[in-house]
């Protein structure tokens, strides 16, 4: 990119740029017409018969140079060649001279600075390429010069260039005065300055457009160099912000159209909103969830928006005593989520009516709450109580859910309390063919013992055919028609109003090989 | 002998028409950017038209465009100027000028009128 | 575009000073022309570009120009001198060419 200081064809009005001397055949200003009937400003000199060592000079006005280090002049001139000039000496040059003066400020005059090389810094001898010839009588024939000349380096507010001729017969048809710089860029969503190269090669920083962030690594930049082109080499840039895609190759983040988002920073274009979400704005990082749906804390950004579970379905409850053993289906509605699980809430009502949660002495397995499967038993239930249970789903938006959550209920109502097991069974006297036994009488909450029911069998024989029963009204019983000198394994258990009770732990007996031995043996 | 030699002038009525003629010697006219300039009787000057040395280019006064021509024969070394719809006001003398020249380049000229012709009156009345 | 304002006349000794202006808006950044013009004849050029004299015009002719105000200088005024003396400019960018009103001088 070229940024102009001074074009002479711009010019609307008289340069009016100092000469020196003041002395006939000096510089002097023409206007004339260019290819496009532009009125434009020259400059011409002519003095081929000039004194040896007389040069005239032609200072243009004072150019501030906006920062330019190195400034590009372009010259377009004509040169008519001194063998067509008949007029003209020894003294007669094809050449001329361009020179510069820095300072801070619009300080020369008409004798100052002193016209010569030091204080003018001379930039080069320019020879014509194309000499004009001409005819007496004819129109003047030539091909234009130009030429471009770099200045510099600059250090001060601005500058002068000058030309000196020694003798020359030319026209200085226009001057542009410009310097180089690095256009403004934008690549990668990353946006470099307009940058003036003060150097052969300058890093310039970057920064991300708008709604763009810096991508992770070094921060971006770019070298411009000094011919005011941008060096070639990957930009480690910046993406759009959560909300934003990128468009316009890559130069402009734009924002997500309603019913679309973008989570992340990054590339990737703006996604419709995922199931039960939406986004009324534009730019939107996340869509918002449905009344009614959610996305846990765990969630990602662009997953979609869930629901609580529904009820679970078909509760069946099979007791056994103080057990309950429940399952039940999964609901209809999972709410969209994976991460089912059930939980129970217990009540119980007291054979009275009055109705409380449960207490702790019920055990619940695998346990009453984050149940991956549909079912738990439920250990340690009082007898003659009224059991509630509650069984829920729940997912991971449970809990973000307000209002009461599903379940689903079941009853159940427990036995009265059957006597406890018999225990502490005596032989009081043995035989070689009866057993005569004797048991402590069992505490049975729900009224008295009604009787009992004696469960033996020979040890060693095991199968139905080969157990006995006996019922007792008393807490004692003789054993009849037994094995000589043999085992048996005896169990006892107490009916109440309730039912029967459970059978006691086994107790071991021998029956007797004969009379006398029988009864040492038990009195031992 | 360098100079310009205006004629053509006279009286007109309003609404009529003239033809001023201006003959160059002396130089190449070929190279030259030529002008009138008038001047009304007692006053003073006030430029009128320009033409560049191959006709690309003309250009009026504001208070004659429209009504005035200006034009050149270089084959035969003459500047005119056509006066159509004359009106009062444009009784003056007449001159014929050039532009200061380039040393060899006719796209160019100065900004001054280094030579003059001697005039040509023009009346405009009924 | 330009204007140019001159007074009407400027009177003069002989042998003495005449100066005679001319000004208009930025004028210094403008080259300025001097014409004079004796009666019954055709203007001749005394000054171009601000202060350069043509061949042929006495010494005693100068000119300067700076800020609003261009001025025509004649030293050691002669009798000869007494003519009207018109400025001119270049109209920026039209090619038109602008004159002032002209000043009478008057040798005493």
């Known amino acids: 990119l070229e940024e102009t200081l001074l074009n002479t064809k711009l010019e609307t009005a008289d340069l009016k740029w100092v000469t020196f001397p003041q002395v006939d055949g000096q510089w002097e200003e023409l206007s004339g017409l260019d290819e496009e009937q532009h009125s434009v400003r020259t400059y011409e000199v002519c003095d081929v018969q000039r004194a040896p060592g007389q040069a005239h000079w032609l200072r243009t006005g004072w150019v501030p140079r906006r920062g330019a280090v190195h400034v590009y002049a372009t010259l377009r001139f004509t040169m008519l060649e001194c063998l067509s000039l008949p007029r003209a000496g020894r003294s007669c040059k094809e050449t001329f001279t361009v020179f510069y003066y820095e300072s801070d400020a619009d300080t020369a005059t008409a004798l100052t600075p002193a016209w010569m090389e030091n204080p003018y810094i001379k930039v080069d001898t320019v020879a014509a390429e194309h000499l004009t010839r001409k005819r007496p009588g004819a129109e003047a024939t030539g091909k234009v010069n130009v030429k471009t000349l770099r200045l510099g380096p600059l250090s001060k507010a601005g500058f002068y260039l000058a030309f000196q001729d020694q003798g020359a017969c030319m026209a200085l048809l226009s001057l542009h005065l410009f310097y180089k710089k690095c256009a403004q860029l934008t690549v990668n969503l990353t946006r470099f300055p307009e940058t003036v190269p003060r150097e052969l090669v300058v890093p310039v920083a970057g920064s991300c457009v708008v709604d763009a962030v810096p991508a992770p690594g070094p921060s971006p930049s770019l070298y411009c160099r000094e011919d005011g082109q941008w060096a070639e080499q990957p930009v480690t840039g910046c993406s759009c912000a959560p909300g934003f895609e990128a468009a316009e190759g890559n130069t402009k983040c734009r924002a997500c159209a309603q019913g679309t988002f973008k989570p992340l920073s990054g590339e990737g274009s703006c996604q419709p909103c995922p199931a039960n979400s939406h986004s009324n704005t534009i730019g939107s990082a996340v869509c918002q969830c449905r009344v009614g749906y959610f996305r846990a804390r765990t969630d990602p950004r662009g997953a979609p928006c869930t629901t609580p579970p529904s009820a679970p379905r078909s509760v069946v409850s099979r007791l056994n005593g103080s057990s309950l053993h429940l399952e039940w289906s999964a609901p209809l509605e999972s709410g969209g989520r994976e991460d089912l699980t059930y939980a129970l809430r217990c009540r119980e009502c007291r054979p009275g009516g009055s109705c409380a949660p449960c207490g702790g002495d019920l055990t619940f397995d695998p346990g009453p709450r984050d149940l991956v499967e549909p079912w738990v038993v439920v250990r340690g239930l009082r007898p003659d109580f009224t059991y509630t249970f509650e069984v829920t789903a729940l997912n991971g938006v449970s809990s973000l859910a307000t209002g009461p959550v599903p379940f689903e209920p079941v009853n159940v109502t427990t036995d009265r309390e059957v006597p406890p097991a018999v225990s502490d069974i005596r032989v009081t006297r043995s035989s070689p063919s009866s057993l005569s036994l004797a048991w402590a009488v069992p505490r049975a909450p729900s009224g008295a013992v009604l009787d009992y029911e004696v469960k033996y069998h020979e040890k060693g024989a095991e199968g139905p055919s080969s157990v006995r029963f006996l019922k007792t009204s008393e807490n004692r019983a003789e054993l009849r028609g037994l094995k000589r000198g043999a085992s048996y394994l005896v169990q006892v258990r107490a009916r109440s109003e309730a039912g029967y009770g459970p059978f006691g732990q086994e107790h071991h007996s021998q029956t007797q090989l004969d009379e006398s031995e029988g009864w040492r043996e038990q009195l031992a | 002998q360098v100079q310009l030699v205006e004629s053509g002038g006279g009286l007109v009525q309003p609404g009529g028409s003239l033809r001023l003629s201006c003959a160059a010697s002396?130089?190449?006219?070929?190279?030259?950017?030529m002008s009138w300039v008038r001047q009304a009787p007692g006053k003073g000057l006030e430029w009128v038209s320009n033409?560049?040395?191959?006709?690309?280019?003309?250009h009026y006064a504001d208070s004659v465009k429209g009504r005035f021509t200006i034009s050149r024969d270089n084959s035969k070394n003459t500047l005119y100027l056509q006066m159509n719809s004359l009106r009062a006001e444009d009784t003056a003398v007449y001159y014929c000028?050039?532009?200061?020249?380039?040393?060899?380049?006719?796209?160019?000229?100065?900004?001054?009128?280094?030579?003059w012709g001697q005039g040509t009156l023009v009346t405009v009345s009924s | 575009d330009i204007e140019l304002t001159q007074p009407p006349s400027v009177s003069v000794a002989p042998g003495q000073t005449a100066r005679i202006s001319c000004s208009g808006d930025?004028?210094?950044?403008?080259?300025v022309h001097w014409y004079q013009q004796k009666p019954g004849q055709a203007p001749v050029l005394v000054i171009y570009?601000?202060?350069k004299r043509p061949s042929g015009i006495p010494e005693r002719f100068s000119g300067s120009n700076s800020g609003n105000t261009a001025t025509l200088t004649i030293s050691g005024t002669q009798a000869e001198d007494e003519a009207d003396y018109y400025c001119?400019?270049?109209?920026?960018?039209?090619?038109?060419?602008?004159f002032g009103g002209g000043t009478k001088l008057t040798v005493l």
């Open positions: 002396g130089f190449t006219f070929n190279n030259a950017w």
């Open positions: 001119q400019a270049w109209g920026a960018g039209s090619h038109q060419m602008v």
């Open positions: 033409i560049t040395s191959s006709s690309s280019m003309t």
């Open positions: 930025n004028l210094g950044k403008k080259y």
């Open positions: 000028a050039r532009k200061g020249m380039s040393f060899y380049n006719n796209k160019y000229a100065k900004s001054m009128f280094d030579l």
């Open positions: 570009y601000d202060s």
